[in-house]
């Protein structure tokens, strides 16, 4: 939802968290603001305090329940409002009718581990975190490997077009230090975006055997 120079963007993690960012040019840094969430068909509502993340933007997380509880469904619509205190009263600064499963951003994959490593290849697995059972197998992943002397931005993206929580990296250089990251995205949702990248997993390929043709 955009009002003039105001921007209010929220994502649902598919389970029990809505994360929001509100930015407004010229807003006072010390103003007290909140996000209010009112689902259309549920008995609860939720509030979080917006905290500054930069000169003109604030963020907060609406915690709807325990991390793995399914607090919203595919048919819920949540009215989200930014409310800022002006003296003794609250003023509404932004509002949107939020369809949670059209605005998804899952948590970063976790538990990355090396399953098997050789001289030229490495098998890595991971787990998805706090993802709804709604998605069944309809998720996709992107992965990238950081090679020596390169940046993450230069790393080519590998796409896994199905729910596959492992990858076999090939054509690696022996006895070399690498880092690996992965992110996840459901197919569902018009405004759905990629999760954050996972924490990098560092690994080293095995050295080539001496005197062997590799």
């Amino acid at each position: 939802a955009v009002n003039g120079t105001s921007r209010f963007t929220c994502f649902y993690n598919s389970r029990a968290n809505i994360s929001c960012v509100w930015s407004q040019d010229g807003a006072l840094q010390d103003t007290s603001c909140q996000v209010h969430a009112w689902p259309d068909r549920r008995r609860w509502n939720q509030t979080c305090e917006l905290l500054p993340v930069s000169q003109a933007s604030w963020a907060c997380n609406l915690i709807l329940g325990t991390p793995d509880s399914q607090k919203l469904t595919a048919v819920d619509i949540v009215t989200l409002r930014v409310m800022c205190r002006e003296g003794v009263r609250w003023r509404m600064m932004a509002i949107q009718d939020f369809k949670p499963f059209e605005n998804l951003r899952l948590m970063a994959p976790i538990s990355l581990q090396v399953v098997h490593v050789e001289t030229h290849r490495c098998n890595i697995s991971w787990k998805i975190s706090q993802a709804s059972h709604y998605f069944e197998r309809h998720l996709e992943f992107e992965a990238r490997t950081l090679s020596p002397g390169h940046t993450w931005e230069e790393a080519p993206l590998m796409t896994l077009k199905q729910k596959q929580e492992w990858i076999c990296l090939e054509t690696l250089t022996p006895d070399t230090q690498y880092e690996f990251q992965v992110r996840v995205k459901p197919l569902q949702g018009e405004f759905t975006t990629w999760s954050p990248w996972s924490q990098p997993l560092a690994f080293r390929t095995k050295p080539a055997a001496l005197g062997k043709d590799t």
Epitope: A74, V75, F101, H133, E136, H138, L187, E190
Partner: antibody, heavy 117, light 107 residues
Framework: EVQLVQSGAEVKKPGATVKISCKVS????????IHWVQQAPGKGLEWMGW????????EYAPGFQDRVTITADTSTDTAYMELSSLRSEDTAVYYC??????????WGQGTTVTVSS | EIVMTQSPATLSVSPGERATLSCRAS??????LHWYQQKPGQAPRLLII???QSISGIPARFSGSRSGTEFTLTISSLQSEDFAVYFC?????????FGQGTKLEIK
């Protein structure tokens, strides 16, 4: 192999109630959604609603809300659909199906319900 | 509720030829459109999700596309087992609704 096996055909009188079962296998029933769809001769396919076996939550389509009850027994991996106050236009094939909320990945074989006086 | 209109109601095509089936939504549904195939006496079978994503195990000759509120299912080279009824279904606004179906018959 994913399977949904439904109970047999039913013949009911107007005003009666029918209860159809759907026994599932080949997947984890406790983190699945089981849906029910009606296919009536003149009306095509109509979504009736679903149950989330993880938490027991149900969602009913407005056109069926007053008359349908969907339940699940996680001890037997079986879902049930009960339709009350039957009328002749409820004569149809009823399907259970598994899927996320948005589409139906696997279907039962269907149960024919005939409502006739 | 959203009305899904499929055209034509019946389509006659020869085996080996291309078939193009259309589905139009009464309002914008983003890419929340799914396609099913149903043969006589059988339950429907899911073919395509989100307008164009094919389901694993479905032959590559089935493909989907979207232009605004109009969605198309294309079968590139018809096989004998493809003659059936095809339904579209939207999942943008509850209750999800189906089209009335297109019957694909042998010419």
């Amino acid at each position: 192999e994913v399977q949904l096996v439904q109970s047999g055909a039913e013949v009911k009188k107007p005003g009666a109630t029918v209860k159809i079962s759907c026994k599932v296998s080949g997947f984890n029933f406790k983190d699945s959604l089981i849906h029910w769809v009606q296919q009536a001769p003149g009306k095509g396919l109509e979504w009736m609603g679903w149950i989330d076996s993880e938490n027991g939550e149900t969602e009913y389509a407005p056109g069926f809300q007053d008359r349908v009850t969907i339940t699940a027994d996680t001890s037997t991996d079986t879902a049930y659909m009960e339709l009350s106050s039957l009328r002749s236009e409820d004569t149809a094939v009823y399907y259970c199906a598994r899927g996320g909320p948005w589409f139906l990945s696997y279907w039962g074989q269907g149960t024919t319900v005939t409502v006739s006086s | 509720e959203i009305v899904m209109t499929q055209s034509p109601a019946t389509l006659s095509v020869s085996p080996g030829e291309r078939a193009t089936l259309s589905c139009r939504a009464s309002q914008i549904i983003s890419n929340n459109l799914h396609w099913y195939q149903q043969k006589p006496g059988q339950a429907p079978r899911l073919l395509i999700i989100y307008g164009l994503q094919s389901i694993s195990g479905i032959p590559a000759r089935f493909s989907g596309s979207r232009s605004g509120t109009e969605f198309t299912l294309t079968i590139s080279s018809l096989q004998s087992e493809d003659f059936a009824v095809y339904f579209c279904q939207q999942s943008n606004n509850w209750p999800w609704t189906f089209g009335q179906g297109t019957k694909l018959e042998i010419k």
